[in-house]
Amino acid sequence: TPEVWVQVRMEATELSSFTIRCGFLGSGSISLVTVSWGGPNGAGGTTLAVLHPERGIRQWAPARQARWETQSSISLILEGSGASSPCANTTFCCKFASFPEGSWEACGSLPPSSDPGLSA
């Protein structure tokens, strides 16, 4: 069964800046990745970025840079300032859609004990 992993990290240089990394562990080719915060996209979450392997990347504030790391993993950097900036207990979710297999999603947040710069 395919799985999705999510890592959330706070940047040491900017304490309110986050990096989210997500990956898909499965055999299907990825059609779309959706990154949201505040919960899954279908349950009140707000979309931060949508990544399509052919048609490009769309992102919304406070997302600063979304990119593909591999064919099955992505990373997203969030701005560290402003009213819409994330806090330490924010939940981030990644949903990977593969055709015709379907979609798989997982969520993660910064562990309470995390020090800046340490991988969650």
């Epitope: 996209n41 279908g42 399509h52 949903k95 055709f99 015709p100 379907g102 979609s103």
Partner: antibody
Framework: EVQLVESGGGLVKPGGSLRLSCAAS????????MSWVRQAPGKGLELVSA????????YYLDTVKGRFTISRDNAKNSLYLQMNSLRAEDTAVYYC?????????????WGQGTLVTVSS | EIVMTQSPPTLSLSPGERVTLSCKAS??????VAWYQQKPGQAPRLLIY???NRFTGIPARFSGSGSGTDFTLTISSLQPEDFAVYFC?????????FGQGTKLEIK
């Protein structure tokens, strides 16, 4: 304007074969996943087969596995369904449909359908 | 396989009325739910995708809502051209599955 035009339907005896075609125009065919959906007289909709844009993955309804084969020719902007060992219960209108990645794989455009009648 | 159950099978209503159609999934389908309209002799037509987003050219009287397993399609004021069969569909997990449809007929 997006257009999908099916052809190849007709009357065939049980055990016979048909090849359905779907000619696509008005969009970059090679970038979209495609499906065949059927509707028996007076009944609901049933996904018969699907193929992804890069022809890596396919799906078949259990009752047609081993009898039907989906294929596509991206150079000819065409989708096909080879139907062998046809049964009376395969009688239906067959639609080809396009899936939109950005719409959660919803089928945003459909052909007008082609009627397949399997009867002795 | 995820089963999509629509209710009721048939509704008899008058133009101008408000109607809510129900669709229940046998397990969570996230937000990967679409609604289609089909008139006799025609192909299905996409109305709503991702639960609540109207497709291009779909009038504002059509709206979708729900999450997880329970979804609804609402038509705020029925027009004569809205009398048709409506299908919900999930595209969360293969195989994509449709509800059995709800037929809206004129009272």
């Amino acid at each position: 304007e997006v257009q999908l035009v099916e052809s190849g339907g007709g009357l065939v005896k049980p055990g016979g074969s048909l090849r359905l075609s779907c000619a696509a125009s008005g969009f970059t065919f090679s970038s979209y996943h495609m499906s065949w959906v059927r509707q028996a007289p007076g009944k609901g909709l049933e996904l018969v087969s699907a193929i992804n844009s890069n022809v890596i993955s396919t799906y078949y309804l259990d009752t047609v596995k081993g009898r039907f084969t989906i294929s596509r020719d991206n150079a000819k902007n065409s989708l096909y369904l080879q139907m062998n060992s046809l049964r009376a219960e395969d009688t239906a209108v067959y639609y080809c449909a396009r899936h939109e990645d950005y719409y959660g794989f919803a089928m945003d455009y459909w052909g007008q359908g082609t009627l397949v009648t399997v009867s002795s | 396989e995820i089963v999509m159950t629509q209710s009721p099978p048939t509704l008899s209503l008058s133009p101008g009325e408000r109607v809510t159609l129900s669709c229940k999934a046998s397990q969570s389908v996230s937000n990967d739910v679409a609604w289609y309209q089909q008139k006799p002799g025609q192909a299905p037509r996409l109305l709503i995708y991702y639960v609540s987003n109207r497709f291009t050219g779909i009038p504002a009287r059509f709206s979708g809502s729900g999450s997880g397993t329970d979804f609804t399609l609402t038509i705020s004021s029925l027009q004569p051209e809205d009398f048709a069969v409506y299908f919900c569909q999930q595209a969360y997990r293969s195989p994509w599955t449709f509800g059995q449809g709800t037929k809206l007929e004129i009272k």
